[in-house]
Interface confidence: medium
Protein backbone atom coordinates (compact mmCIF):
# COMPACT_ATOMS: atom_id res chain seq x y z
CA UNK A 1 0.00 0.00 0.00
CA UNK A 2 2.70 2.52 -1.05
CA UNK A 3 6.25 3.31 -0.42
CA UNK A 4 7.69 3.35 3.26
CA UNK A 5 9.76 6.11 5.24
CA UNK A 6 13.11 5.03 6.46
CA UNK A 7 12.58 2.89 9.64
CA UNK A 8 12.98 4.56 13.11
CA UNK A 9 16.36 3.11 14.19
CA UNK A 10 18.00 5.54 11.36
CA UNK A 11 16.95 8.64 12.62
CA UNK A 12 19.61 9.37 15.31
CA UNK A 13 22.40 7.73 12.84
CA UNK A 14 21.25 10.18 10.49
CA UNK A 15 21.35 12.77 12.76
CA UNK A 16 24.93 11.62 14.01
CA UNK A 17 26.02 11.30 10.47
CA UNK A 18 25.02 14.67 9.01
CA UNK A 19 26.82 15.79 12.21
CA UNK A 20 29.88 14.21 11.71
CA UNK A 21 29.86 14.87 7.85
CA UNK A 22 29.17 18.72 8.14
CA UNK A 23 31.16 19.38 10.73
CA UNK A 24 34.57 16.88 10.51
CA UNK A 25 36.49 18.23 13.13
CA UNK A 26 33.36 16.94 15.76
CA UNK A 27 33.99 19.37 18.42
CA UNK A 28 30.86 20.92 19.11
CA UNK A 29 32.00 24.21 19.96
CA UNK A 30 34.09 25.16 16.92
CA UNK A 31 30.45 25.02 15.23
CA UNK A 32 29.35 28.46 14.16
CA UNK A 33 26.37 30.06 15.18
CA UNK A 34 23.64 29.07 12.51
CA UNK A 35 23.33 32.59 11.56
CA UNK A 36 26.92 32.81 10.95
CA UNK A 37 26.88 29.11 8.77
CA UNK A 38 24.07 30.63 6.89
CA UNK A 39 26.17 33.72 5.64
CA UNK A 40 29.16 31.21 5.06
CA UNK A 41 26.92 28.61 2.75
CA UNK A 42 25.24 31.63 0.78
CA UNK A 43 28.78 32.11 -0.04
CA UNK A 44 29.20 29.29 -2.45
CA UNK A 45 26.53 28.80 -5.22
CA UNK A 46 24.49 25.68 -5.21
CA UNK A 47 25.82 22.71 -5.27
CA UNK A 48 29.00 23.43 -4.01
CA UNK A 49 30.39 23.94 -0.01
CA UNK A 50 32.72 25.70 1.73
CA UNK A 51 36.31 24.27 2.26
CA UNK A 52 36.23 23.37 6.24
CA UNK A 53 39.94 24.83 5.90
CA UNK A 54 39.69 27.42 3.91
CA UNK A 55 36.89 29.94 3.42
CA UNK A 56 38.03 31.02 0.30
CA UNK A 57 37.42 27.53 -1.66
CA UNK A 58 34.33 26.49 -3.26
CA UNK A 59 34.50 22.94 -3.38
CA UNK A 60 31.72 20.80 -5.44
CA UNK A 61 29.60 18.40 -3.43
CA UNK A 62 29.71 14.80 -3.90
CA UNK A 63 26.91 13.18 -6.00
CA UNK A 64 24.46 11.02 -4.44
CA UNK A 65 25.74 7.24 -3.98
CA UNK A 66 29.15 9.05 -3.17
CA UNK A 67 31.05 10.23 -0.30
CA UNK A 68 33.80 13.18 0.34
CA UNK A 69 37.02 10.83 0.47
CA UNK A 70 38.70 14.24 0.35
CA UNK A 71 38.17 18.06 0.21
CA UNK A 72 39.41 19.48 -3.28
CA UNK A 73 43.20 20.47 -3.12
CA UNK A 74 42.15 24.46 -4.76
CA UNK A 75 39.70 26.43 -6.61
CA UNK A 76 38.19 24.71 -9.89
CA UNK A 77 39.60 21.44 -8.88
CA UNK A 78 37.90 18.38 -8.38
CA UNK A 79 36.16 16.78 -4.95
CA UNK A 80 37.53 13.61 -4.08
CA UNK A 81 34.52 11.55 -3.99
CA UNK A 82 33.96 7.75 -3.33
CA UNK A 83 31.39 5.21 -4.54
CA UNK A 84 29.64 4.03 -1.13
CA UNK A 85 30.32 0.60 0.05
CA UNK A 86 27.49 -2.18 -0.65
CA UNK A 87 25.11 -1.70 2.67
CA UNK A 88 25.43 1.77 2.45
CA UNK A 89 23.95 5.17 0.32
CA UNK A 90 23.66 8.43 -0.03
CA UNK A 91 20.55 9.87 -1.41
CA UNK A 92 21.36 13.59 -2.27
CA UNK A 93 24.07 15.58 -3.11
CA UNK A 94 26.29 15.73 0.36
CA UNK A 95 29.81 16.51 1.54
CA UNK A 96 29.38 13.58 3.80
CA UNK A 97 32.49 12.04 5.45
CA UNK A 98 30.81 8.96 5.42
CA UNK A 99 28.00 7.28 3.04
CA UNK A 100 24.81 5.76 5.84
CA UNK A 101 24.01 2.55 6.10
CA UNK A 102 21.37 1.12 4.97
CA UNK A 103 18.34 0.27 6.97
CA UNK A 104 16.23 -2.86 7.26
CA UNK A 105 13.16 -3.82 6.96
CA UNK A 106 11.30 -5.20 10.56
CA UNK A 107 10.00 -8.14 9.71
CA UNK A 108 8.45 -8.52 13.50
CA UNK A 109 6.31 -5.81 12.13
CA UNK A 110 5.10 -7.61 9.17
CA UNK A 111 7.26 -4.86 7.21
CA UNK A 112 8.31 -6.41 3.16
CA UNK A 113 11.02 -5.03 1.63
CA UNK A 114 9.61 -2.77 -1.23
CA UNK A 115 12.94 -2.12 -3.03
CA UNK A 116 16.55 -2.96 -2.04
CA UNK A 117 18.68 -0.66 -0.89
CA UNK A 118 21.70 1.11 -3.65
CA UNK A 119 23.85 3.31 -3.63
CA UNK A 120 21.95 6.55 -3.60
CA UNK A 121 18.47 5.43 -2.13
CA UNK A 122 17.68 3.84 1.18
CA UNK A 123 15.74 0.37 1.09
CA UNK A 124 12.02 1.19 1.19
CA UNK A 125 9.72 -0.79 3.24
CA UNK A 126 6.28 -1.34 3.24
CA UNK A 127 3.36 -3.98 3.73
CA UNK A 128 1.55 -6.65 1.67
CA UNK A 129 -1.28 -6.23 -0.59
CA UNK A 130 -4.74 -5.14 1.50
CA UNK A 131 -2.65 -4.35 4.43
CA UNK A 132 -2.89 -0.85 5.98
CA UNK A 133 0.28 0.42 8.55
CA UNK A 134 -0.32 1.22 12.16
CA UNK A 135 2.32 3.62 13.41
CA UNK A 136 4.00 3.60 16.62
CA UNK A 137 6.26 6.76 16.05
CA UNK A 138 6.62 8.79 12.80
CA UNK A 139 9.04 6.27 11.33
CA UNK A 140 8.08 2.93 13.05
CA UNK A 141 5.53 1.16 11.29
CA UNK A 142 3.55 -1.82 11.70
CA UNK A 143 1.26 -3.99 9.24
CA UNK A 144 -2.41 -5.22 9.37
CA UNK A 145 -4.84 -6.54 7.77
CA UNK A 146 -7.46 -4.52 5.87
CA UNK A 147 -11.07 -5.16 7.16
CA UNK A 148 -13.09 -6.79 5.15
CA UNK A 149 -16.49 -5.23 5.92
CA UNK A 150 -18.19 -8.76 5.91
CA UNK A 151 -21.97 -8.48 6.98
CA UNK A 152 -21.17 -4.79 5.58
CA UNK A 153 -20.45 -2.43 2.87
CA UNK A 154 -16.88 -0.72 2.69
CA UNK A 155 -17.74 3.16 3.68
CA UNK A 156 -13.98 4.15 2.98
CA UNK A 157 -11.53 1.68 1.31
CA UNK A 158 -8.11 0.77 2.79
CA UNK A 159 -5.40 3.52 2.78
CA UNK A 160 -1.98 2.97 3.35
CA UNK A 161 -1.97 4.29 6.75
CA UNK A 162 -5.60 4.05 7.66
CA UNK A 163 -7.56 0.38 7.79
CA UNK A 164 -11.51 0.27 5.84
CA UNK A 165 -14.03 2.06 7.47
CA UNK A 166 -17.21 -0.34 7.13
CA UNK A 167 -20.90 0.21 7.61
CA UNK A 168 -23.35 -2.10 8.46
CA UNK A 169 -26.33 -4.26 6.75
CA UNK A 170 -29.24 -4.02 8.74
CA UNK A 171 -29.34 -6.56 11.53
CA UNK A 172 -25.36 -5.88 12.17
CA UNK A 173 -24.10 -3.25 14.33
CA UNK A 174 -19.86 -2.02 13.92
CA UNK A 175 -17.45 -3.45 17.08
CA UNK A 176 -13.86 -3.05 16.05
CA UNK A 177 -14.36 -2.35 12.29
CA UNK A 178 -16.24 -5.63 11.78
CA UNK A 179 -20.13 -5.84 11.23
CA UNK A 180 -21.46 -8.29 14.43
CA UNK A 181 -24.73 -9.54 14.50
CA UNK A 182 -27.34 -7.62 16.45
CA UNK A 183 -28.06 -10.82 18.37
CA UNK A 184 -24.74 -10.54 20.17
CA UNK A 185 -25.61 -7.08 21.35
CA UNK A 186 -25.84 -6.91 25.04
CA UNK A 187 -27.94 -3.92 26.69
CA UNK A 188 -25.10 -2.07 28.37
CA UNK A 189 -23.21 -1.63 24.93
CA UNK A 190 -23.87 1.67 22.54
CA UNK A 191 -25.12 -1.08 19.88
CA UNK A 192 -28.27 -0.82 21.94
CA UNK A 193 -29.12 2.01 19.93
CA UNK A 194 -28.19 0.80 16.69
CA UNK A 195 -30.02 -2.53 16.91
CA UNK A 196 -32.56 -1.24 19.08
CA UNK A 197 -35.61 -1.65 15.92
CA UNK A 198 -34.12 -4.98 15.02
CA UNK A 199 -34.68 -6.25 18.75
CA UNK A 200 -38.08 -5.24 19.44
CA UNK A 201 -38.87 -6.82 15.71
CA UNK A 202 -37.80 -10.38 17.04
CA UNK A 203 -39.54 -10.25 20.18
CA UNK A 204 -42.98 -8.83 18.53
CA UNK A 205 -43.73 -10.56 15.74
CA UNK A 206 -41.39 -14.21 15.65
CA UNK A 207 -42.73 -15.96 12.54
CA UNK A 208 -43.37 -19.42 13.32
CA UNK A 209 -42.27 -20.66 10.11
CA UNK A 210 -38.75 -19.73 11.45
CA UNK A 211 -39.11 -21.37 14.58
CA UNK A 212 -39.60 -24.70 13.44
CA UNK A 213 -37.13 -24.48 10.42
CA UNK A 214 -34.35 -22.99 11.55
CA UNK A 215 -33.82 -25.86 13.93
CA UNK A 216 -33.76 -28.08 11.18
CA UNK A 217 -31.62 -26.32 8.74
CA UNK A 218 -28.76 -26.20 11.92
CA UNK A 219 -29.19 -29.95 12.03
CA UNK A 220 -28.88 -30.57 8.11
CA UNK A 221 -26.26 -28.22 8.26
CA UNK A 222 -24.12 -29.88 11.18
CA UNK A 223 -24.91 -33.66 9.51
CA UNK A 224 -23.46 -32.24 5.80
CA UNK A 225 -20.64 -30.98 7.99
CA UNK A 226 -19.75 -34.04 9.81
CA UNK A 227 -19.70 -35.87 6.60
CA UNK A 228 -17.92 -33.87 4.87
CA UNK A 229 -15.22 -34.12 7.87
CA UNK A 230 -15.11 -37.64 7.67
CA UNK A 231 -14.76 -37.33 3.60
CA UNK A 232 -11.92 -35.02 3.75
CA UNK A 233 -9.85 -37.22 6.69
CA UNK A 234 -10.49 -40.07 4.65
CA UNK A 235 -9.04 -38.72 1.38
CA UNK A 236 -6.39 -36.92 3.00
CA UNK A 237 -4.21 -39.91 3.17
CA UNK A 238 -5.15 -40.91 -0.32
CA UNK A 239 -4.15 -37.22 -1.50
CA UNK A 240 -1.11 -37.25 0.28
CA UNK A 241 0.29 -40.22 -1.04
CA UNK A 242 -0.75 -39.01 -4.53
CA UNK A 243 0.78 -35.57 -3.95
CA UNK A 244 4.29 -37.22 -2.99
CA UNK A 245 4.36 -39.89 -5.24
CA UNK A 246 5.31 -36.88 -8.10
CA UNK A 247 8.34 -39.51 -8.83
CA UNK A 248 11.64 -36.82 -9.96
CA UNK A 249 11.55 -36.55 -13.65
CA UNK A 250 7.66 -35.92 -13.76
CA UNK A 251 5.90 -32.86 -13.73
CA UNK A 252 6.38 -30.05 -10.82
CA UNK A 253 3.99 -28.51 -9.53
CA UNK A 254 2.88 -25.20 -10.68
CA UNK A 255 4.70 -21.58 -9.57
CA UNK A 256 3.79 -20.13 -6.67
CA UNK A 257 2.19 -16.97 -6.75
CA UNK A 258 3.86 -13.40 -6.26
CA UNK A 259 4.44 -11.86 -3.10
CA UNK A 260 2.20 -9.03 -3.35
CA UNK A 261 -0.70 -10.71 -5.54
CA UNK A 262 -2.35 -13.21 -3.28
CA UNK A 263 -3.59 -13.08 -0.01
CA UNK A 264 -3.87 -16.26 2.06
CA UNK A 265 -7.21 -17.51 3.54
CA UNK A 266 -6.64 -18.62 7.46
CA UNK A 267 -7.59 -22.30 7.84
CA UNK A 268 -10.40 -21.85 10.98
CA UNK A 269 -10.97 -17.88 11.20
CA UNK A 270 -12.73 -16.90 13.99
CA UNK A 271 -15.27 -13.88 13.79
CA UNK A 272 -13.06 -11.77 16.20
CA UNK A 273 -14.82 -10.45 19.43
CA UNK A 274 -14.07 -7.60 21.63
CA UNK A 275 -14.60 -7.99 25.15
CA UNK A 276 -16.72 -5.76 27.62
CA UNK A 277 -14.81 -4.68 30.63
CA UNK A 278 -15.50 -7.86 32.95
CA UNK A 279 -15.12 -10.01 30.12
CA UNK A 280 -12.54 -12.77 30.24
CA UNK A 281 -11.40 -13.58 26.47
CA UNK A 282 -11.32 -17.14 25.96
CA UNK A 283 -8.66 -18.71 23.25
CA UNK A 284 -11.59 -18.31 20.74
CA UNK A 285 -12.56 -15.24 20.93
CA UNK A 286 -10.24 -12.95 21.90
CA UNK A 287 -9.92 -8.79 21.00
CA UNK A 288 -8.20 -8.14 17.91
CA UNK A 289 -7.82 -4.94 16.30
CA UNK A 290 -6.19 -6.32 13.22
CA UNK A 291 -4.42 -9.10 11.81
CA UNK A 292 -2.42 -9.86 9.14
CA UNK A 293 -1.95 -12.56 6.25
CA UNK A 294 1.38 -14.21 6.16
CA UNK A 295 1.54 -15.88 2.89
CA UNK A 296 3.36 -15.30 -0.09
CA UNK A 297 0.98 -17.81 -2.23
CA UNK A 298 -2.85 -18.70 -2.32
CA UNK A 299 -4.01 -20.98 -0.16
CA UNK A 300 -6.32 -24.07 -0.66
CA UNK A 301 -7.82 -26.05 2.15
CA UNK A 302 -6.07 -29.10 0.53
CA UNK A 303 -2.31 -27.33 1.50
CA UNK A 304 -2.26 -29.02 4.77
CA UNK A 305 -5.46 -30.49 6.34
CA UNK A 306 -5.28 -28.98 9.75
CA UNK A 307 -8.03 -31.11 11.48
CA UNK A 308 -5.98 -32.32 13.71
CA UNK A 309 -4.18 -29.34 15.17
CA UNK A 310 -6.61 -26.20 15.35
CA UNK A 311 -4.68 -22.82 15.93
CA UNK A 312 -4.79 -22.01 19.82
CA UNK A 313 -4.41 -18.74 18.92
CA UNK A 314 -6.96 -16.21 17.70
CA UNK A 315 -7.38 -16.26 13.86
CA UNK A 316 -7.22 -13.43 11.84
CA UNK A 317 -11.09 -11.95 11.84
CA UNK A 318 -12.79 -10.55 9.28
CA UNK A 319 -12.39 -13.41 7.38
CA UNK A 320 -16.20 -14.36 7.22
CA UNK A 321 -15.92 -18.26 8.48
CA UNK A 322 -18.63 -20.41 9.26
CA UNK A 323 -19.17 -19.82 12.83
CA UNK A 324 -20.45 -23.15 13.74
CA UNK A 325 -16.52 -24.66 12.43
CA UNK A 326 -14.53 -21.30 14.01
CA UNK A 327 -16.76 -22.39 17.99
CA UNK A 328 -15.25 -26.11 17.40
CA UNK A 329 -11.92 -25.03 16.26
CA UNK A 330 -11.67 -22.83 18.56
CA UNK A 331 -12.71 -25.29 21.82
CA UNK A 332 -11.00 -28.02 20.74
CA UNK A 333 -9.55 -29.28 23.32
CA UNK A 334 -6.37 -31.47 20.76
CA UNK A 335 -3.20 -28.98 21.84
CA UNK A 336 -0.88 -28.03 18.64
CA UNK A 337 1.72 -29.57 18.99
CA UNK A 338 4.31 -26.46 18.79
CA UNK A 339 2.06 -25.36 21.93
CA UNK A 340 3.61 -28.54 23.87
CA UNK A 341 7.21 -27.68 22.33
CA UNK A 342 7.04 -24.38 23.77
CA UNK A 343 5.36 -25.20 27.08
CA UNK A 344 7.43 -27.72 27.61
CA UNK A 345 10.71 -27.68 30.04
CA UNK A 346 13.10 -29.69 27.69
CA UNK A 347 15.44 -27.63 25.68
CA UNK A 348 14.50 -28.48 22.21
CA UNK A 349 17.48 -30.75 20.65
CA UNK A 350 18.69 -30.25 17.56
CA UNK A 351 18.82 -31.60 14.41
CA UNK A 352 20.62 -34.93 13.32
CA UNK A 353 22.46 -33.97 10.24
CA UNK A 354 23.60 -37.11 10.28
CA UNK A 355 19.73 -38.79 9.71
CA UNK A 356 18.12 -37.56 6.29
CA UNK A 357 15.07 -38.65 7.57
CA UNK A 358 14.69 -35.53 9.08
CA UNK A 359 15.00 -33.08 6.72
CA UNK A 360 12.95 -35.52 4.20
CA UNK A 361 10.33 -35.53 6.65
CA UNK A 362 9.69 -32.00 6.44
CA UNK A 363 10.19 -31.97 2.30
CA UNK A 364 7.10 -34.71 2.45
CA UNK A 365 5.24 -32.27 4.66
CA UNK A 366 5.28 -28.82 3.38
CA UNK A 367 3.15 -28.23 0.40
CA UNK A 368 4.71 -28.09 -2.74
CA UNK A 369 3.19 -24.59 -3.20
CA UNK A 370 4.32 -22.96 0.18
CA UNK A 371 7.20 -24.57 -0.07
CA UNK A 372 9.26 -21.57 -1.60
CA UNK A 373 7.38 -19.36 1.23
CA UNK A 374 8.94 -21.54 3.44
CA UNK A 375 12.50 -21.75 2.74
CA UNK A 376 12.37 -18.24 2.46
CA UNK A 377 11.29 -17.85 5.60
CA UNK A 378 13.94 -20.18 6.74
CA UNK A 379 16.52 -17.48 5.53
CA UNK A 380 17.50 -18.63 1.78
CA UNK A 381 17.42 -16.46 -0.74
CA UNK A 382 16.03 -16.30 -4.02
CA UNK A 383 19.18 -16.62 -5.22
CA UNK A 384 20.14 -19.64 -3.52
CA UNK A 385 16.45 -21.47 -3.92
CA UNK A 386 17.08 -21.27 -7.96
CA UNK A 387 20.48 -22.26 -8.02
CA UNK A 388 19.57 -25.27 -5.94
CA UNK A 389 16.57 -25.97 -8.41
CA UNK A 390 18.67 -25.60 -11.51
CA UNK A 391 21.43 -28.11 -9.79
CA UNK A 392 18.64 -30.66 -8.88
CA UNK A 393 17.39 -30.52 -13.04
CA UNK A 394 13.52 -31.46 -12.62
CA UNK A 395 14.09 -33.66 -9.37
CA UNK A 396 12.20 -31.39 -7.20
CA UNK A 397 12.42 -33.81 -3.75
CA UNK A 398 16.00 -33.50 -4.20
CA UNK A 399 15.74 -29.95 -4.93
CA UNK A 400 14.26 -29.21 -1.67
CA UNK A 401 15.95 -31.67 0.66
CA UNK A 402 19.23 -29.82 -0.75
CA UNK A 403 17.00 -26.53 0.28
CA UNK A 404 16.99 -27.63 3.98
CA UNK A 405 20.38 -28.89 3.91
CA UNK A 406 21.77 -25.52 3.20
CA UNK A 407 19.64 -24.01 6.41
CA UNK A 408 20.77 -26.37 7.81
CA UNK A 409 24.49 -26.06 7.74
CA UNK A 410 24.66 -22.48 7.87
CA UNK A 411 22.64 -22.34 10.89
CA UNK A 412 24.36 -22.84 14.72
CA UNK A 413 23.56 -26.60 15.47
CA UNK A 414 21.22 -25.30 19.06
CA UNK A 415 19.28 -23.21 16.84
CA UNK A 416 18.34 -25.86 13.72
CA UNK A 417 15.31 -27.44 15.83
CA UNK A 418 12.42 -28.81 14.82
CA UNK A 419 11.01 -25.75 17.13
CA UNK A 420 12.18 -23.31 14.60
CA UNK A 421 10.44 -25.24 12.06
CA UNK A 422 7.33 -25.33 13.90
CA UNK A 423 7.14 -21.30 14.39
CA UNK A 424 7.78 -21.00 10.73
CA UNK A 425 5.31 -23.31 9.59
CA UNK A 426 3.43 -21.53 12.59
CA UNK A 427 3.41 -18.37 11.05
CA UNK A 428 2.42 -19.70 7.65
CA UNK A 429 -0.91 -21.31 9.17
CA UNK A 430 0.36 -25.24 8.64
CA UNK A 431 0.33 -26.74 11.58
CA UNK A 432 -1.46 -29.66 10.35
CA UNK A 433 1.79 -30.38 8.51
CA UNK A 434 3.76 -29.81 11.75
CA UNK A 435 2.34 -32.66 13.54
CA UNK A 436 2.38 -34.35 10.03
CA UNK A 437 6.05 -33.84 10.49
CA UNK A 438 6.16 -34.86 13.98
CA UNK A 439 3.86 -37.91 13.58
CA UNK A 440 6.29 -39.30 10.56
CA UNK A 441 9.41 -39.34 13.05
CA UNK A 442 8.10 -40.30 16.01
CA UNK A 443 5.29 -42.29 15.06
CA UNK A 444 1.40 -42.55 14.97
CA UNK A 445 1.97 -42.95 18.85
CA UNK A 446 1.04 -40.18 21.43
CA UNK A 447 2.78 -37.03 20.74
CA UNK A 448 5.90 -36.73 23.15
CA UNK A 449 5.30 -34.09 25.50
CA UNK A 450 9.10 -33.04 25.07
CA UNK A 451 10.31 -31.76 21.84
CA UNK A 452 12.81 -34.24 21.29
CA UNK A 453 13.10 -35.56 17.44
CA UNK A 454 15.06 -38.65 16.82
CA UNK A 455 14.96 -41.74 18.89
CA UNK B 1 -0.45 -23.10 28.38
CA UNK B 2 0.64 -19.65 27.28
CA UNK B 3 -0.93 -17.22 30.21
CA UNK B 4 -0.84 -13.44 30.67
CA UNK B 5 -2.29 -12.01 33.70
CA UNK B 6 -2.92 -8.38 34.46
CA UNK B 7 -2.83 -6.87 37.89
CA UNK B 8 -2.67 -3.45 39.94
CA UNK B 9 -5.65 -1.77 38.16
CA UNK B 10 -8.25 0.19 40.45
CA UNK B 11 -9.80 3.65 41.44
CA UNK B 12 -7.72 6.35 41.08
CA UNK B 13 -8.20 10.05 41.16
CA UNK B 14 -7.65 12.35 38.27
CA UNK B 15 -3.67 13.16 38.45
CA UNK B 16 -2.87 10.02 40.43
CA UNK B 17 -0.77 6.87 39.41
CA UNK B 18 -0.84 3.58 38.68
CA UNK B 19 1.29 0.71 37.57
CA UNK B 20 0.41 -2.02 35.70
CA UNK B 21 1.72 -5.60 35.99
CA UNK B 22 1.32 -8.19 32.95
CA UNK B 23 2.97 -11.73 34.39
CA UNK B 24 3.71 -14.04 31.72
CA UNK B 25 3.90 -17.79 31.46
CA UNK B 26 4.15 -20.67 29.33
CA UNK B 27 6.35 -19.25 26.28
CA UNK B 28 9.66 -17.53 25.94
CA UNK B 29 9.02 -14.31 26.94
CA UNK B 30 12.00 -12.61 26.12
CA UNK B 31 11.77 -13.49 22.58
CA UNK B 32 8.39 -11.48 21.65
CA UNK B 33 7.51 -7.73 21.22
CA UNK B 34 4.95 -6.80 24.20
CA UNK B 35 2.08 -4.70 23.77
CA UNK B 36 -0.32 -2.83 25.88
CA UNK B 37 -3.60 -2.31 24.82
CA UNK B 38 -6.91 -0.61 26.12
CA UNK B 39 -10.62 -0.73 25.45
CA UNK B 40 -12.81 2.37 27.03
CA UNK B 41 -16.38 1.45 28.18
CA UNK B 42 -18.59 1.25 24.80
CA UNK B 43 -15.78 2.34 22.94
CA UNK B 44 -12.84 0.48 20.34
CA UNK B 45 -9.92 -0.79 21.46
CA UNK B 46 -6.95 1.47 21.27
CA UNK B 47 -2.97 0.60 21.15
CA UNK B 48 -1.27 2.05 24.32
CA UNK B 49 2.28 1.18 24.18
CA UNK B 50 4.80 -1.43 22.54
CA UNK B 51 8.22 -2.49 24.10
CA UNK B 52 10.67 -4.61 22.06
CA UNK B 53 12.12 -8.07 23.67
CA UNK B 54 15.26 -6.47 24.68
CA UNK B 55 13.20 -3.46 25.98
CA UNK B 56 15.45 -1.27 24.03
CA UNK B 57 12.74 -0.17 21.82
CA UNK B 58 9.40 2.11 23.59
CA UNK B 59 6.69 3.25 21.38
CA UNK B 60 3.07 4.99 22.71
CA UNK B 61 -0.20 6.25 21.25
CA UNK B 62 0.18 10.50 21.12
CA UNK B 63 -2.56 10.21 23.90
CA UNK B 64 -0.35 8.91 26.47
CA UNK B 65 2.71 10.25 25.40
CA UNK B 66 5.18 11.62 28.23
CA UNK B 67 2.57 10.22 31.06
CA UNK B 68 2.80 6.50 30.26
CA UNK B 69 6.23 4.25 30.09
CA UNK B 70 6.32 0.88 29.43
CA UNK B 71 9.05 -1.50 30.73
CA UNK B 72 9.69 -5.03 30.80
CA UNK B 73 11.75 -7.76 33.50
CA UNK B 74 12.76 -10.54 31.59
CA UNK B 75 14.13 -12.37 34.35
CA UNK B 76 11.04 -11.99 36.02
CA UNK B 77 8.25 -12.77 33.15
CA UNK B 78 6.80 -9.35 33.69
CA UNK B 79 5.31 -6.44 31.66
CA UNK B 80 4.71 -3.19 33.27
CA UNK B 81 2.97 -0.20 32.25
CA UNK B 82 3.39 2.75 35.04
CA UNK B 83 0.86 5.26 34.40
CA UNK B 84 0.96 9.37 35.98
CA UNK B 85 -1.15 12.02 35.32
CA UNK B 86 -4.13 9.94 34.94
CA UNK B 87 -6.71 11.39 33.63
CA UNK B 88 -10.46 10.50 33.03
CA UNK B 89 -10.55 9.63 29.74
CA UNK B 90 -7.50 6.73 30.84
CA UNK B 91 -10.28 4.80 31.81
CA UNK B 92 -10.55 1.20 30.09
CA UNK B 93 -9.87 -2.11 30.25
CA UNK B 94 -6.13 -2.59 29.91
CA UNK B 95 -4.81 -5.73 28.24
CA UNK B 96 -1.35 -7.00 27.78
CA UNK B 97 -0.90 -9.17 24.27
CA UNK B 98 1.59 -10.58 22.89
CA UNK B 99 2.57 -11.50 19.50
CA UNK B 100 4.16 -13.71 16.85
CA UNK B 101 7.30 -13.01 15.62
CA UNK B 102 6.48 -13.00 11.84
CA UNK B 103 3.32 -10.98 11.75
CA UNK B 104 1.67 -8.56 13.55
CA UNK B 105 -0.96 -10.75 15.06
CA UNK B 106 -1.85 -10.79 18.26
CA UNK B 107 -2.07 -14.01 19.29
CA UNK B 108 -2.50 -13.83 23.16
CA UNK B 109 -4.50 -11.46 25.67
CA UNK B 110 -4.56 -11.24 29.11
CA UNK B 111 -8.01 -10.78 30.44
CA UNK B 112 -7.62 -7.45 31.15
CA UNK B 113 -7.34 -5.25 34.40
CA UNK B 114 -10.04 -2.26 34.88
CA UNK B 115 -8.29 1.25 35.31
CA UNK B 116 -11.02 3.72 36.43
CA UNK B 117 -9.45 7.75 36.99
CA UNK B 118 -12.32 9.57 38.82
CA UNK B 119 -12.77 11.93 41.41
Known amino acids: MGLSTVPDLLLPLVLLELLVGIYPSGVIGLVPHLGDREKRDSVCPQGKYIHPQNNSICCTKCHKGTYLYNDCPGPGQDTDCRECESGSFTASENHLRHCLSCSKCRKEMGQVEISSCTVDRDTVCGCRKNQYRHYWSENLFQCFNCSLCLNGTVHLSCQEKQNTVCTCHAGFFLRENECVSCSNCKKSLECTKLCLPQIENVKGTEDSGTTVLLPLVIFFGLCLLSLLFIGLMYRYQRWKSKLYSIVCGKSTPEKEGELEGTTTKPLAPNPSFSPTPGFTPTLGFSPVPSSTFTSSSTYTPGDCPNFAAPRREVAPPYQGADPILATALASDPIPNPLQKWEDSAHKPQSLDTDDPATLYAVVENVPPLRWKEFVRRLGLSDHEIDRLELQNGRCLREAQYSMLATWRRRTPRREATLELLGRVLRDMDLLGCLEDIEEALCGPAALPPAPSLLR | EVQLLESGGGLVQPGGSLRLSCAAS????????MYWVRQAPGKGLEWVSF????????YYADSVKGRFTISRDNSKNTLYLQMNSLRAEDTAVYYC????????????WGQGTLVTVSS
Open chain 2, 51 to 58: ISPSGRET
Open chain 2, 97 to 108: AKTLSADGRFDY
Open chain 2, 26 to 33: GFTFIGYN
